[in-house]
């Protein structure tokens, strides 16, 4: 089931994802100035059987500009900057990853994508916090969070992190000095906005219809 | 006959922006068919060959809304149109709107 | 666009009857293949999506398949069941339907 809401926001904090459960959906996104391939996937999937998970799909962009060419074009300078991600995109990579079975690593990057990844997890998926640089963390507890299923909803589990504001950065996990949590999690006080039960994507018809903007008839 | 018409389908409580949102026809007694899709985050838009030109989707994502409108209605557009949003299938859908096309 | 056919087109069952739908695709789609069911006067409800059971769905609807061929399966017939059942790929745009499976009451 997907996770219909994001994890939550720390102040001064950014989460990474160290591995993809399966089912995960990755947008196929493209920078300024290019787009989807019309016959190309609308995201990349994390599929894969008992062995072995991989990502399903190709996300493609192609210039917007040129119907069949994916020609580099000049990147404005909002563009040039790093390439970020929903989960904050870290050279460093748990080498366990790639063994935790049901899961997909870190999708490559692939042509023209955009500077922003949007995922959309499933429920049992983790996430890391960290905090921005310039800021210290502080432990209550564990510095991540779960989408869990409760009650036919989704929800996330609330980070027991805070980022102060000192000159000292936190790292994700592995990278930091064991801290002592207390047992037990608090969990989130807001649970899943969305849930296949209790949410509806509502049609209906446009409210008014004024003949001279909303009809028109053939003389 | 003749007249134009557009439907609207709003979403709620998750990123409207990041989904894709397709429109189903369904005539009186038949099956569901695929119209065609959008991407609210950049308007990028796919059609089913056998609706391409005959139907116009587009969206808002300021207000959450996608829309499909028709220039000029003929009887054989009389149907229900549901929207849905894409994820591992179209996983939620609107209620419908019943759409009545007659002279 | 890829083309399903969905078989049989209606059947009848009773309750507790396991109950089996097909559908195949003109072309492999692998396993990008959902499952909806549609009562009268209701909007369509996904309930397999690729090869997992969406939550919330009963543990006696079950899918298989992978490339062109693939089943839906009712263990056990209840009377909530009857419906229409539709198939579709969503391995290429357009995400194609099935002609729609009726579930009837014998």
């Known amino acids: 089931e997907l996770c219909d809401d994001d994890p939550p926001e720390i102040p001064h904090a950014t989460f990474k994802a160290m591995a993809y459960k399966e089912g995960t959906m990755l947008n196929c996104e493209c920078k300024r100035g290019f787009r989807r391939i019309k016959s190309g996937s609308l995201y990349m999937l994390c599929t894969g059987n008992s062995s072995h998970s991989s990502w399903d799909n190709q996300c493609q962009c192609t210039s917007s500009a040129t119907r069949n060419t994916t020609k580099q074009v000049t990147p404005q300078p909002e563009e040039q900057k790093e390439r970020k991600t929903t989960e904050m995109q870290s050279p460093m990579q748990p080498v366990d990853q790639a063994s935790l079975p049901g899961h997909c690593r870190e999708p490559p990057p692939w042509e023209n994508e955009a500077t922003e990844r949007i995922y959309h997890f499933v429920v049992g998926q983790m996430v890391y916090y960290q905090c921005v640089q310039g800021y210290r963390a502080l432990h209550r507890g564990p510095a991540e969070s779960v989408c869990k299923m409760t009650h036919g909803k989704t929800r996330w589990t609330q980070p027991q992190l805070i980022c102060t504001g000192e000159m000292e950065t936190s790292q994700f996990p592995g990278e930091e000095k064991p801290q002592a949590s207390p047992e037990g999690r608090p969990e989130s006080e807001t649970s899943c906005l969305v849930t296949t039960t209790d949410f509806q994507i509502q049609t209906e018809m446009a409210a008014t219809m004024e003949t001279s903007i909303f009809t028109t008839e053939y003389q | 006959p003749g007249e134009s018409l557009q439907i609207s389908c709003k979403g709620s409580g998750y990123k409207f922006a990041n989904y894709w949102i397709g429109w189903v026809r369904q005539m009186p007694g038949k099956g569901l068919e695929w119209m065609g899709i959008i991407y609210p985050g950049d308007s990028d838009t796919r059609y089913s060959p056998s609706f391409q030109g005959q139907v116009t989707i587009s969206a808002d994502k300021s207000i959450s809304t996608a829309y499909l409108q028709w220039s000029s209605l003929k009887a054989s557009d009389t149907a229900m149109y549901y929207c849905a949003r894409l994820g591992w299938g179209m996983d939620v859908w609107g209620q419908g709107t019943t759409v009545t096309v007659s002279s | 666009d890829i083309v399903m056919t969905q078989s049989p087109s209606s059947l009848s069952a009773s309750v507790g009857d396991r109950v089996t739908i097909t559908c195949r695709a003109s072309?492999?789609?692998?396993?990008?293949l959902n499952w909806y069911q549609q009562k009268p006067g209701k909007a369509p409800n996904l309930i397999y999506a690729a090869s997992s059971l969406r939550s919330g769905v009963p543990s006696r609807f079950s899918g298989s398949g992978s490339g062109t061929d693939f089943t839906l399966t009712i263990s056990s017939l209840q009377p909530e069941d009857f419906a229409t059942y539709y198939c579709q790929q969503s391995y290429s745009t357009p995400w194609t339907f099935g002609q729609g499976t009726k579930v009837e009451i014998k």
């Open positions: 072309q492999s789609i692998s396993s990008y």
